[in-house]
C-alpha cells in the first residue's frame, strides 16, 4: 500500500499586508480517515491556524469545499494578512484516535509579509 503523502507545493509565499494569502495543501489519499489541521510553526509550541472538525477561525476559509466526500485539497486562504502572520505554515494529516494521532506533515510553506504599497 502506497504511503500517504501531504503535499505543500510552495516552499514560500510572499503577500502584501492587508491582502489574502493562499496556502496550498493536497493529500495523496483519504485513507486512513482523520482530520487535516494547519499549524504555524513546528514542535510543541505550534499555533493551530485551522481545524475543520471544530473551532472558530474567522480569518481562515478553505479553498475547496471540505464537505465533498472525495475532497483531497485542504488549501486555505487567510484574509487581512498582517506582519504578525509571518512564519512557516504546516498542513498536517492526523489518523483518527483518542486523541487523534499525527500521521504526516507537509514540508511547510513560509509566509512572508511585505509592506503595504503606498
Amino acid at each position: 500500500e502506497e504511503e500517504l503523502q501531504v503535499i505543500q507545493p510552495e516552499k514560500s509565499v510572499s503577500v502584501a499586508a492587508g491582502d489574502s494569502a493562499t496556502l496550498n495543501c493536497t493529500v495523496s489519499s483519504l485513507i486512513p480517515v482523520g482530520p487535516i489541521q494547519w499549524f504555524r510553526g513546528a514542535g510543541p509550541g505550534r499555533e493551530l491556524i485551522y481545524n475543520l472538525k471544530e473551532g472558530h477561525f474567522p480569518r481562515v476559509t478553505p479553498v475547496s469545499d471540505p464537505t465533498k466526500r472525495n475532497n483531497m485539497d485542504f488549501s486555505i486562504r487567510i484574509s487581512n494578512i498582517t506582519p504578525a502572520d509571518a512564519g512557516t505554515y504546516y498542513c498536517v494529516k492526523f489518523r483518527k484516535g483518542s486523541p487523534d494521532v499525527e500521521l504526516k506533515s507537509g514540508a511547510g510553506t513560509e509566509l512572508s509579509v511585505r509592506a503595504k504599497p503606498s
Epitope: I31, P32, P35, T67
Partner: antibody
C-alpha cells in the same frame, strides 16, 4: 436551535414520483453537507442520499442510484429528494439529517411518511 | 441486509451496564456513530467519531473501539434508556453511510 422539517410525503402508486423537501433553520445551512435517511415500517435505518454543502457533489447507495436525486437550494435553506420509479419497498419514513465534518449525522428531522401502494 | 453487524437485542436491569457491539467496517476507512431511537421518534446522536459524546448526552453513554469492532456502553442504565440503538458509519472508501440492523435495549 437546529431545526429540520420534512414535508412532501404521501401515498403514491408504484412507478410514480414524489419530491420531498426539508426546511432547515438554526444553523448556516450552506456550510453543511446534508443527507436523507429512510426507515421502512418496523425496520432499521438506511441512508439513501447525501450532498455536499455547495450542492455540486451527490452520493447514493446502489439501491436508489438512478431513481433518486438529492438537491439543495442554499438561498432557501431547503434540501430536496426527488424520487422516481417508486417501488413498494421504498415505503418508509424519510428523514433529512445534517452531516458532521466527517459525514455522520448530528441532527435529524421528525420525518415524513412515503407510502408506495396501488 | 445491513453492512454493519450488531446484536438484535440486549437486556439489562436498572443500574447495570449495557454493552452493544458493532462490527463490519475497516478501522482505517470508517468513522462510527451511535443513534438512539425511541418509538415514534427520530433518531438522536449519542456517540460520534467512535467515542465522542455530543453535548447534552448523559455521561453514562460512552463509546470505544478495538480493531474492527466498536462498542456502545451505557453505565448505570436507567428505564428511560430503553430504546433501539443503531450503529452507523461513514465509509471513506465508498463514500457511503452504512447502518447496522439495530439493537433493542430492554430495561428489565
Amino acid at each position: 436551535e437546529v431545526q429540520l422539517v420534512e414535508s412532501g410525503g404521501g401515498v403514491v402508486q408504484p412507478g410514480g414520483s414524489l419530491r420531498l423537501s426539508c426546511a432547515a433553520s438554526g444553523f448556516t445551512f450552506s456550510s453543511n453537507a446534508m443527507s436523507w435517511v429512510r426507515q421502512a415500517p418496523g425496520k432499521g435505518l438506511e441512508w439513501v442520499a447525501g450532498i455536499s454543502a455547495g450542492g455540486s457533489d451527490t452520493y447514493y447507495p446502489a439501491s436508489v442510484k438512478g431513481r433518486f436525486t438529492i438537491s439543495r437550494d442554499n438561498s432557501k435553506n431547503t434540501l430536496y429528494l426527488q424520487m422516481n420509479s417508486l417501488r413498494a419497498e421504498d415505503t418508509a419514513v424519510y428523514y433529512c439529517a445534517r452531516e458532521t465534518w466527517n459525514h455522520l449525522f448530528d441532527y435529524w428531522g421528525q420525518g415524513t411518511l412515503v407510502t408506495v401502494s396501488s | 441486509s445491513y453492512e454493519l453487524t450488531q446484536p438484535p437485542s440486549v437486556s439489562v436491569s436498572p443500574g447495570q451496564t449495557a454493552r452493544i457491539t458493532c462490527s463490519g467496517g475497516a478501522y482505517s476507512s470508517y468513522y462510527y456513530a451511535w443513534y438512539q431511537q425511541k418509538p415514534g421518534q427520530a433518531p438522536v446522536l449519542v456517540i460520534y467519531s467512535d467515542d465522542k459524546r455530543p453535548s447534552g448526552i448523559p455521561e453514562r453513554f460512552s463509546g470505544s473501539s478495538s480493531g474492527t469492532t466498536v462498542t456502545l456502553t451505557i453505565s448505570g442504565v436507567q428505564a428511560e434508556d430503553e430504546a433501539d440503538y443503531y450503529c452507523g458509519g461513514y465509509d471513506q472508501s465508498s463514500y457511503t453511510n452504512p447502518f447496522g440492523g439495530g439493537t433493542k435495549l430492554t430495561v428489565l
